[in-house]
Structure formats: structure tokens, C-alpha cells
Amino acid sequence: KSSNEATNITPKHNMKAFLDELKAENIKKFLYNFTQIPHLAGTEQNFQLAKQIQSQWKEFGLDSVELAHYDVLLSYPNKTHPNYISIINEDGNEIFNTSLFEPPPPGYENVSDIVPPFSAFSPQGMPEGDLVYVNYARTEDFFKLERDMKINCSGKIVIARYGKVFRGNKVKNAQLAGAKGVILYSDPADYFAPGVKSYPDGWNLPGGGVQRGNILNLNGAGDPLTPGYPANEYAYRRGIAEAVGLPSIPVHPIGYYDAQKLLEKMGGSAPPDSSWRGSLKVPYNVGPGFTGNFSTQKVKMHIHSTNEVTRIYNVIGTLRGAVEPDRYVILGGHRDSWVFGGIDPQSGAAVVHEIVRSFGTLKKEGWRPRRTILFASWDAEEFGLLGSTEWAEENSRLLQERGVAYINADSSIEGNYTLRVDCTPLMYSLVHNLTKELKSPDEGFEGKSLYESWTKKSPSPEFSGMPRISKLGSGNDFEVFFQRLGIASGRARYTKNWETNKFSGYPLYHSVYETYELVEKFYDPMFKYHLTVAQVRGGMVFELANSIVLPFDCRDYAVVLRKYADKIYSISMKHPQEMKTYSVSFDSLFSAVKNFTEIASKFSERLQDFDKSNPIVLRMMNDQLMFLERAFIDPLGLPDRPFYRHVIYAPSSHNKYAGESFPGIYDALFDIESKVDPSKAWGEVKRQIYVAAFTVQAAAETLSEVA
């Protein structure tokens, strides 16, 4: 049941009033406004947009709106020395060159400052050598190459198709395999859905379209030169050699027309199986090198990008809480884009803008939320979540004491099929209850709830009659709040049908073709999916900021902890002999989970019964709920990943986008059969079980009666 217990309350100032104020037409208008020119991080255009948003949020009625600036390491192509890849003959002559940039979309021919496709933070270099095709460049792809096929990537240039995992993991894997350069490309198998035209006549990727993106392996560090601390005016900066997460080999992205020219000549080994074949008319030979007639030809990369310390600007808006102003509910999404940002991020930024407008309208009518709501327009997300991370580093002491929840608001859509939610288990019940109150925008579900269409289209694999809610991974601005600070976090957007569309993300992701027209013509002409996402994100923020008792259910954490413990135990049990030899036991973990379950159950009973009119007891119970997520934080962090401190969840070490449960144990067990010192390896497994068990038990105790 929605709450309406803020100060100056009148019957209309409740969740319904807030939701009714949200308008699809406004989101459409804001999206158009935000996408007419590029807003690359560190540019004047993006600074001007920051000031525009600051001004508009003030007009909408927020109490204060400030710019928070930082000087962080960014990366740009050299304007006079473009990046490209060549095929060179035995004389060193370039007989083929890849495109220098994408052909512009219709209507944008005269737009200046479109950054050409590049891999942000690639070092400079002009390596030349034989090509090896490495499929998606996942950990398992390199295992297949090196262990099964005995192909050595050392000193080779590897070509990998985008998709499946974060591009930074691909580059890291290539580096570890000894490659001297990486070419990333979009294969039509992953970025061209059958039966759909390419842009501008549909939402598929044209042959000249290219995905930009950063290739860092920051592991939550933020600005590579100031890990752990804000990149402010008096910051001490590391030298570039000590910077966190920078790639050591040149990397460059290309489209499938250019990839065709590189792959069609490949010789060497045939692909190991059909999963290594894309949709181009090429053999997908692994190499190394080109086939017979072309064996003397090599591939040469020409990369001249530069890393530069550049000023970025977050916009931080505040709507002060009437009752608990020292409790913060944060709604944040980024503003910087690679080019026009039609989907990423402006479909999210437009939704945030409308949510701010709606809250502002209520505030102008005398309403205030119970708790403070902070709104953020983050900068430099595309360069490694830099704006959000620097701000959180600067405000970490406040956030860890006052942070109730963080709701992320990047792209509102990646498809138009159904809802997709990733969040802490604490928010499961909030999401379920909210979506039951919202109308579904889906065709065939007129008059039905969002919960119903979502559950039908994306059912939970474990619980019948419930929708799938996924683990939080990373690759977006919630990372620092959840993985480092332990603030309950969630995200929601409309997505594609993953069963019928096997391509990775959406085809035009991070290309010049991600325009307003892409959204308006092909994804959401009525902006009804955007409106639904605004209702979900805004509704979550409203309820988190306004409900008397925080809408967190700790029993849902108990359920998933048991599931995760079972899962990690079954992984370990693939090695029964070693578990016996090294006396590996999960008893402590299962015991801690059992204790957590019992204590959470008792806490929930007390939560139903306590005197909500007693502000001290109310605050005490709410603090136990707020600090539960914090209790899963290990101040020492995960091994070699000090800024990933959540013991239950972390981004996968093999794919930043994916969440892994009990990551410390998982990583200790990963590929353990190949470790040179099994005794040491299983000792680390035991240590990680100990850390996990202790953390779960400690978290459980935060829910016990205080005295």
C-alpha cells in the first residue's frame, strides 16, 4: 500500500499524485532536447548541458542544485592523426584501411564534434603481425584456444567479436594471452536481428556502424589516477604508469564491413565448433595469419589516442526531507554520451528529468518527502563510472551513515518487450508491490498490471507466479554505491525478448546511429515504455523516501543467501576428492545462513508489531533495515579488488556486467584444477568460506534485538 505520510499532507499528495504527474509527452520532449548534439564527457557541450539541467531542476522546484566538478583521466582520439587498421603487403604498403568514422545518420550530416569510433584509454601504438580470431575473447574462449587447440596468441593481434561480456574483460584476457593488439568488431550474429532493417530504416546496425566504449579494468576504482579518493583541486595523482586499470596494448573497434575484409582472408585452424561462427560470409578460421595466397600480408594497427586529465561535472539536486532530512534516497543516471545518446543515456536522463519535474510540482504545492531525495546527473560514466565514483568518494562518510537507497537511471529501454529489474533482495517486495499497482504498457495486456505482463514474459526460474529479478553486476553508476559502500541499490528498464533475440545489448549501442529518431520511430513511438520505466523508477524513489517503515524485506535476503550457498557448494562439490583431502567444509556458511534466516524472520515479526508512533523505535528499526546492506561490506574488500567490498555480490571477474554471488569463494574455486599449488588454492577457498560465513553471521546479528 502506498504511503502518504509526509508533512503538509493533503489527500492528493500521495504516490498516485506523483505518478499521475508523469507524462510521456514530456519525456519525449526532454529526450529530443538532450540528443540534438553530442555530449561527450569533458567537452564544452556536456558542460553546457550540465548547466541547463541545473537551471531546469531549480525551476522544477528542488531546494538546491549544485555542480560538483572533478579533474579525471579521460581519453580522446587525436584529431589530426586518426586511428585505423590496415592490411599491409610484404613491402609494407597499406592495401586496405578500415574506415576512419561512421557515415552520419540522415539529418545529422552537418553536426560537428562527432567523436570517431575508438576504444577509450587504448595506449598509442602501431603493432603489426598475424591475426588470431578469438571469438568473444571470453575466459573460456582463450581456454579453448590455448589448452585445446594449442594456439599461442603471444605476439599476435587478436580480433574479437563484441558481445557476451564487457569489452574491458576481453582486452584483459587478450593481454594475459600475450597479444600485442586487439581489434573489436560487431558481428551481425550479435548486432543484426533477422527480419529487421538497418538504420535509418530499422534498429539494426549498418555495416559501417561501430560500437565505442572504454576498455578499462578499474574494478571500482573510479578515476585511474586517484583511486579511493576524489579527483579534486588538491588531489595527489599517480603517474600514468601506476594508473589503475589501463590497458597495455592498442585496441580499436570496427564495424562488420571492415571486419569482413580482415576475416575473409584468415587461414590456420578452422573454428572449433559452430559457437565460434558469426553471420558474416567468412570461414571464421582462427588463424594465426592469413591463408595461403595472402600469407605474406599482415595486419597493422595505427592508434594515436591520448589520455588527458579533464574536468567533468555532476549535477546534484536536493529535495530536503521533512522528517528525516539526514536520510538520503538517491536517483542517479549519467548525462555524458558517446555521440547523441538516443538510448544511452538520454532515454534515462529524460525520465529522471520528468521525475524531478513531478516531485517539484508536488513540492510547490506544499508537499515534502519524509526523507531527503538526491537527484544526480553523472558525468563520465562512459569513461569508467567516473563522475558517480568521484562524488561518492568525496561524500563517502555521509553516504555510509545516511544512504538509504540508490536507484540507477541509465537507459530506460534496451528493447520494448518487458520490464527488466536488477536489485538487492531487500527491494524485491517493493518492486513486486509497486508493479502490481502500475498498468502494463504491453500490447495484449490492456487493463492488466505491469506485474502480470512482466511475470508472464519474464518468469522467475525459481518461483512460479513471480517475475525474474536479477543480481546487480556492474558497468553502471550504481557500482560505487552498492559494491563499495553497501547502499541498497536497484535498476529498472524495458528490455528485449532475450529468448528470441540473441544479439548482445541493442544493435546500435554506442554508435552514431543511437539517435532520437531511433527511439521515436522504432522503439517507443508513444513513449509508453519510457513512461512505465519512469513510474517504476520514480515509484521506487517515492516509496523509499516516503514510507514510514522502509520498504525493505530482510527475509528475501535470507532466501537468496540459501540459494547462493547451495550454488557455491555444488560448484565446490565438483571436486569431492580435494574437498576431502583439504578438509573443506561449508558448514559454517550454511550455519550462518540458517541463523540469518531465523533472525530475519524474527525481525520481520517485530517490524509488524512495533509502535510506529514512537519516533525513536521507528528510527531504530529503520536503521537496522538501512544498515543491513552495509553489513555485507568487508572493509578489506575482495582479493586484488579492494573497491569491490560486498561479500554477497560482486561483478564477475570474467564479465563486469554480470553479478556473481559469493564472489570470493567463486573466484577461489574458479579453474582450481589448473592451479600449480593445490594446497594453497584450496586454502584460499577455505579462507573465503570463512570470510563469507563470518559476514553473513555478522549481518544477521545487526537484525537481532538491540538489547
Epitope: 550530416e109 530504416d201 559501417g208
Partner: antibody, heavy 119, light 106 residues
Amino acid sequence: EVQLVESGGGLVQPGGSLRLSCAASGFTFSDYYMAWVRQAPGKGLEWVANINYDGSSTFYADSLKGRFTISRDNSKNTLYLQMNSLRAEDTAVYYCGRQVGYYDPMDYWGQGTTVTVSS
Amino acid sequence: DIQLTQSPSSLSASVGDRVTITCRASSSVSHMYWYQQKPGKAPKPWIYRTSNLASGVPSRFSGSGSGTDYTLTISSMQPEDFATYYCQQYHSYPLTFGQGTKLEIK
């Protein structure tokens, strides 16, 4: 075999109108963009207009906007160019061509039809 | 609009000569396309996406370039190569052609 056959050319007075047609065969017409290109006597090639698969998007040379209209009838596998307010400088051979998509070149051309604008 | 300037406008060559035609764009384009036209005939696609030979085009033809400067090269002129060659950009609309280069027998 892909075939494009233009028709409708002829002699017309300045200020007059003409409608060119291009009959397509040997391929799925609705799967391709189509274009018109012209060539004045003794001169080079000049792009006139093109049209997307279903006719919902059209593109024109700036100098011809408002006078020329490109259209298509996918049920008849035919491309059209309606030319109004014709001028002497519109005298040319008009070729129709096929494009895979917006960013792709004309991979097949017709043999052309001659338009002469003269009093 | 992107202007394309071909040079030379005309060229006299002998059979066996190596011939290079250049096409300069007024601003950068991602690729260049080339057509061959013989008198009284429709143009034929000759080179696509800068360096790819169209079906049936002899291997003595090659294309190269990037940014604003592109070339079509004939390594050894043959009698059937005497024709007019046009460059065209499909990078951005309006689509534009070069003014043509006429190859004549010396």
C-alpha cells in the same frame, strides 16, 4: 537476372511536367532502396533522389527539392519520378538504380531514358 | 554538401601504362566508390568501399585512400579500360559525384 527499364522520357516544353517510370524485375523490389541519377549531354553524373524500401523516406538533391518527387509502388515493382516546372537545364538522360540500403552504392543501373526540355 | 574533385579531368595513356586517378573530397568521407562509364552506356559499379573490386572487374584495378584523398589505379592499361571514371561518396546526403576523368588512347 536483375533488370531496370526506364520509360516516360521525351520532349517537353519549359514549365511542363513529365513522369518517369522504372520497371524492376529479377529481384525482390521491396528489399531495396531505389534512386534516380541524371546526366546532362556531355556532362557528368548528378544524383537526383532516392527512396527507401517502403517509400516512407525520400531524399533529394537540394536544387531539385519541390519540383521533383520520387515515389514507388512495390505492388507493381515500379519506381517513379514526377518532374514538374521543367527547365532547359533538366535536359538529361535519367537513370534509375538499385541500392541495398541508405549507405550503399547503386549496384545495378538501367540504360536510361532521355528527357529533353525545349520550346 | 561534400564536393568531390577528380584529377586529372582527362588523361591520354597508352596500353600498358600505369594510370592513377585521384578524387579529393571537401571533407572527410568514410569510403569512396568508383564507376566506369563508356559512351552511350549506363555507368557500371567498378570499385566499392574504397578498395573492393566489383564483380568482373580485372585485378589490374585497385582503389585506396582514406579521409579526403582517394585513388583509383590501373596497373597496366588495356584497350577496354579507356572510358570515363567517376568517384562518388555515399558518406552523407546529398550524394555527390566527381566531375569524371576521361581516359583516352594516346
